[in-house]
Amino acid sequence: KFSKQSWGLENEALIVRCPRQGKPSYTVDWYYSQTNKSIPTQERNRVFASGQLLKFLPAAVADSGIYTCIVRSPTFNRTGYANVTIYKKQSDCNVPDYLMYSTVSGSEKNSKIYCPTIDLYNWTAPLEWFKNCQALQGSRYRAHKSFLVIDNVMTEDAGDYTCKFIHNENGANYSVTATRSFTVKDEQGFSLFPVIGAPAQNEIKEVEIGKNANLTCSACFGKGTQFLAAVLWQLNGTKITDFGEPRIQQEEGQNQSFSNGLACLDMVLRIADVKEEDLLLQYDCLALNLHGLRRHTVRLSRKNPIDHHS
């Protein structure tokens, strides 16, 4: 459950984030699971731990394996696992499936291709972009921040796109490449004011004190690829990240689905070890797109033990 697959190429930088999160002030210890050997924090090592991040500078095939991260706070420990695989560089142009990040879809109106995992690295613009191993040239292609924009998208633009950038660590530069497929949809889509399917407005969710609870915010935004759409959770009108309660975490990344042709997103809020004070909070599911924002509010209530009468 708290395991994450990460992969990279030999002689490139690879940075992995611990799947368990905590406050920046919490210490994170990393271990190589097979040997239970602690990963050093000294930056002179090729592989070293830096808080929530595990850095391979550069990576070697022999680094492959499962790494354990333990987030330590004064009151609890949380364990996560990073399953790291380092592959040899391919001699030919083809990028094998196991090196591909998630496929993204585009349309004439929306043609952003984000460079996967780039936010983990210390990089500077511009990014280099390649399609099927050919450097992208021409005014239709614009490298903007961490994504590529393609103007006047055509079906021929479908293919595998690779971003290449330089990670800088203490003055040393390391190359990083990441590839994902891009598909083009030529269906006529539409966008509408967000519709929240779950939770219901002012829903009361029963939870058990001391147990874990999940809340799912699910909304639909129209048909086809949506230019801007997001779902997120708030606590008492505050962003989850600003609220500062590590037991309550938003799932990283939004799951996209197409329900009856509609483009929908969902975001799970995980509450670990439910406490009495959690029942006093307002949990806001927010769904937003270009048309506007819709909010549904949930409150938690204590689930009463069922009485068994004969």
């Epitope: 004011f193 407005q201 997120l232 708030q234 008492n236 009108g237 505050t238 962003k239 307002q282 806001d284 927010l286 937003l288 048309h291 506007g292 924002l293 819709r294 909010r295 549904h296 509010t297």
Partner: nanobody, 118 residues
């Protein structure tokens, strides 16, 4: 509202709207304007909880809506003003579940006049 006035084309103004009597969180707040003989139109809207903003196409890139939680104040920074921006500008707020340029707002200010001459 405050901060209205007369300005030359290309100039700037900053409108302020001080909210009182309610918490500043979980509100949809916006700026609207009404020119003589025209319908009131949405200019910019902000959801206070997460700084999500919406702008009318006519002001995108020129106007910026922002908030100061501590002062419970909403702002509209207007740059590169044009004569067609001349209007009575209203601040509005709503605590309902929707936020956007097209929604109905429950609370309205008195308005402040902005005049842009060429």
């Amino acid at each position: 509202e405050s901060g209205g006035g007369s300005v030359q084309s290309g100039g700037s103004l900053r409108l302020s709207c001080a909210a009182s009597g309610y918490t500043f969180r979980r509100y949809c707040m916006g700026w609207f304007r009404q020119a003589p003989g025209k319908e009131r139109e949405g200019v910019a809207v902000l959801y206070t909880g997460v700084d999500i903003t919406y702008y009318a196409d006519s002001v995108k890139g020129r106007f910026t809506i922002s908030q100061d939680n501590a002062k419970k104040t909403l702002y509209l920074q207007m740059n590169s003003l044009k004569p067609e921006d001349t209007a009575l500008y209203y601040c509005a707020a709503d605590s309902g579940p929707l936020c956007g340029l097209g929604i109905q707002f429950g609370y309205w200010g008195q308005g402040t006049q902005v005049t842009v001459s060429s």
